[in-house]
């Protein structure tokens, strides 16, 4: 006999990384029928929502209408169908960023490179802090984690035309509050006709959506969780 | 934005009854889900019971479960918090809170989740 319920899927929309003094709404989504959905920040009780007409609704949001450091964290969500509780979702980290200072990135030998060449990333922020956090835009969450008193080095090591994009870099002051973004560096490998043309790149977004941190994911993996990229969330961890 | 106004603290004695209201400016309060904590002296604040914005949804701490309830008129902008079976250990500042949640069966428990606060009123339980 089955004793729990399958567990539910939890995201964030517009992202998991949200600027501070913006909002964010956490999405779980369970099954129909459900009667009751808990939000748990941290391990404890968060918010409820008994959704009705519980056979017609098979997904909760809840809305988080300014980000700030005591909200960022781990969230997880629960649903219920009777007396039947699901097991738990993945746990979600919510991360505030836009926090204090702003980190400077450079690219050495420079951001023209050729196939093969081996590309170190520089992180540097002056202030109190000893993570650092490197990300290239696109679809996937490529997150690389460092570490230095006030700069931390990213070898890429030979790079390949699949290396192309656009990166940015965050100082964290704790694994749920992040710095300001850097200032973009566009990383162009060029190599012979044949590989960069068939080279896949991730696609990247225009520079104005930066500020709703859609740098990580496509809508449409966002809303299909079986295709979820839990790379960046997992480093967290 | 919304003001919260909470009254009818009080001295009571083991046993009784007290209701308290709170008031909300605006025009908007059936957007609000809302909220009742109390602080006892020497304690963290802590959750006692929820409203959706609609009345539909209710949820209580367990250690007033059954003897407290919560309801709200959203034509007076008012929420309420009807306190039975009152004991020493009730005794703490009141405080209402507001929040504007996405959905109308929604209610937070955690006092981070909460946008707008009262000044609270005070319950005394003892003889």
């Known amino acids: 006999q089955q004793q729990t319920l399958p567990k539910p899927f939890i995201w964030a929309e517009p992202h998991f990384m949200v600027p501070k003094e913006k909002q964010v709404t956490i999405c779980c989504q369970g099954n129909y029928g459900a009667v009751e959905y808990q939000l748990h920040f941290e391990g404890s009780l968060f918010a409820v929502d008994r959704p009705k007409p519980p056979e017609r609704i098979n997904k909760v949001q809840f809305y988080i209408p300014d980000m700030n450091s005591r909200m960022a964290g781990q969230y997880s969500c629960i649903y219920r169908v009777g007396e039947l509780w699901s097991e738990p979702s993945n746990l979600l980290d919510l991360v505030v960023t836009e926090m204090y200072d702003t980190p400077t990135l450079s690219v050495h030998p420079g951001p023209e490179v050729i196939s093969g060449e081996k590309v170190t990333f520089y992180c540097r922020l002056d202030t109190a802090t000893s993570m650092f956090l490197l990300l290239k835009e696109g679809r996937s969450s490529h997150v690389q984690r460092g570490y230095g008193k006030v700069q931390a080095e990213f070898p890429l090591g030979p790079v390949t035309t699949a290396h192309r994009g656009t990166y940015r870099c965050f100082g964290s002051y704790n694994n749920h509050a992040w710095s300001f973004p850097s200032e973009p560096v566009k990383l162009l490998v060029t190599g012979d006709i044949e590989n960069t043309s068939l080279a896949p790149e991730d696609p990247t977004f225009p520079a104005d959506t930066w500020g709703t941190y859609l740098l990580t994911t496509e809508t449409g993996l966002q809303k299909d969780h079986a295709l979820w990229d839990h790379t960046a969330q997992n480093l967290l961890r | 934005q919304v003001q919260l106004v909470e009254s009818g603290g009080g001295l009571v004695q083991p046993g009784g009854s007290l209701r308290l209201a709170c008031a909300a400016s605006?025009?908007?309060?059936?957007?609000?889900?809302m909220g009742w904590f109390r602080q006892a002296p020497g304690k963290e604040r802590e959750f006692v019971a929820a409203i959706s914005r609609n009345g539909g949804t209710t949820y209580y701490a367990d250690s007033v479960k059954g003897r407290f309830t919560i309801s709200r008129d959203n034509a007076k902008n008012t929420v309420y918090l009807q306190m039975n079976s009152l004991k020493p250990e009730d005794t703490a500042v009141y405080y209402c809170?507001?929040?504007?949640?996405?959905?109308?069966?929604?209610?937070?428990?955690?006092?981070?989740?909460?946008?707008?606060w009262g000044q609270g009123t005070l319950v005394t339980v003892s003889s």
């Open positions: 605006g025009r908007t309060f059936s957007t609000y889900a």
């Open positions: 809170a507001a929040s504007r949640p996405l959905s109308n069966t929604q209610v937070g428990v955690a006092s981070a989740w909460y946008e707008f």
